[in-house]
């Protein structure tokens, strides 16, 4: 029972985590304009892995995709790769773990097979979580570096009077979503690995017992039988809740005007 609960909980936690990783990857707010110097700016900039956006106080938001691959910083490419690898591994892990769930009966699948699948999905979740955490952390480090670099030359004097303010970027909501989601996926993976240990059949070797029948002296020496055949081990009716991540890009723009991509 505890094994089933641990496995189920691990699956649900990983599911939420992977949904979060997908959401974070799709979000535009990986880095947001630092408003320390100008808290009442009329133009607010924020950037994601796939596009950068500008929100005006008028309510109009313009987003532009990064339509180049070669022109992008290597670090950004690396973060993209880490997040995609995390999502792919997580998705495969979810698929494997669905079949590995103790509460789901698939043909005559042995518990040993379920244990192996549980371990495989657990490892996949751990790696997926680590990829997401690594991706977000690399991006955060890149932001910190750029932040202090831009602070160093924040005001470039031009002709004494005129000031050119350099836009600084700080941590966006997506980073926190990514860290939490990566952590959840990691925890879910660990839980799956723990559940695997409980699922793995132990070799039960019975001591040789002599049965003396009248008139015959026959000794039965049973070998190590498998603990379970894979049937009827869990007849309880359990519900599986399947969740999905949906990210909505709320881009407010006015009707009857040009579309800006």
């Amino acid at each position: 029972m505890a094994v089933t609960a641990c496995q189920g909980l691990g699956f649900v936690v990983s599911l939420i985590g992977i949904a979060g990783i997908i959401a974070a990857t799709c979000m535009d707010q990986w880095s947001t304009q630092d408003l320390y110097n100008n808290p009442v700016t009329a133009v607010f900039n924020y950037q994601g892995l796939w596009r950068s956006c500008v929100r005006e106080s008028s309510g109009f938001t313009e987003c532009r995709g990064y339509f180049t691959l070669l022109g992008l910083p290597a670090m950004l490419q690396a973060v993209r790769a880490l997040m995609i690898v995390g999502i792919v591994l997580g998705a495969i892990g979810l698929l494997v773990s669905i079949f590995a769930l103790k509460c789901i009966r698939i043909g005559s699948m042995e518990d040993s097979a379920k244990a192996n699948m549980t371990l495989t999905s657990g490892i996949m979740f751990i790696v997926s979580g680590l990829c997401a955490i690594a991706g977000v952390s690399v991006f955060a480090n890149m932001l910190v570096t750029n932040f202090w670099m831009s602070t160093a030359n924040m005001y470039t004097g031009m002709g004494g009077m005129v000031q050119t303010v350099q836009t600084r970027y700080t941590f966006g909501a997506a980073l926190f979503v990514g860290w939490v989601a990566g952590g959840l996926t990691l925890i879910g993976g660990v839980m799956m690995c723990i559940a695997c240990r409980g699922l793995a059949p132990e070799e039960t070797n019975y001591k040789a017992v002599s049965y003396h029948a009248s008139g015959h002296s026959v000794a039965y020496k049973p070998g190590g039988f498998k603990a379970s055949t894979g049937f009827g081990s869990n007849t309880k009716n359990k519900k599986i809740y399947d969740g999905g991540a949906r990210t909505e890009d709320e881009v407010q723009s006015y009707p009857s005007k040009h579309d800006y991509v």
């Epitope: 304009q33 100008n38 009442v40 700016t41 009329a42 133009v43 900039n45 924020y46 950037q47 950068s52 956006c53 500008v54 005006e56 106080s57 008028s58 309510g59 109009f60 313009e62 532009r64 005129v162 000031q163 050119t164 303010v165 350099q166 836009t167 006015y254 005007k257």
Partner: antibody, heavy 118, light 113 residues
Amino acid sequence: DVQLVESGGGLVQPGGSRKLSCAASGFTFSGFGMHWIRQTPEKGLEWVAYVSSGSRPIYYADTVKGRFTISRDNPKNTLFLQMTSLRSEDTAMYFCARFYYGNSFDHWGQGTLVTVSA
Amino acid sequence: DIVMTQSPSFLTVTAGEKVTMSCKSSQSLLNSGNQKNYLTWYQQKPGQPPKLLIYWASTRESGVPDRFTGSGSGTDFTLTINNVQAEDLALYYCQNAYSFPLTFGAGTKLELT
């Protein structure tokens, strides 16, 4: 057709109060940020206050902060400017304007004159 | 606050001429996020409210004749009126649309000889 009509102007004593209204029509009022801008022959155009489409955030010019309050009633398509502790330098033509692309003002009302004098 | 300085204060022209007026800001109005300059131009005729001409420094508002052209970047901006017409005689204001408080220039008055 977009229309903005201001009302509520008039002669006010120094230290007195006045509430200006701006009735909007011809567009989805709740979808746009709105402003009050004033004009005097001496100072020219001066931005006064801003209220976003959802009533938050609100910004004020330093010269009116703490004395003026901008608000809106989206169901009634009306913008307000509550003015208190009025000074002679607040004498001006007050316009309401709609916020637009590029943080510009694409539609202005005809204005309402507020005169602060003893 | 961003200070907007317009020059000249008065411009006397003859119909059909090309005219240019300048607007300088104390701080750059170029937004790095979209490479757009947050400067707006307005035209105001006597007894009327200002009318939007150009936003994003060079984007003409619909219905504005193409003889009006906005240019410039960063801190220096120009409004050019080609083939000036009698109906163009008005006050022209530039506005900082980059940060609050939204500030206006003192204006350039266009007059006919």
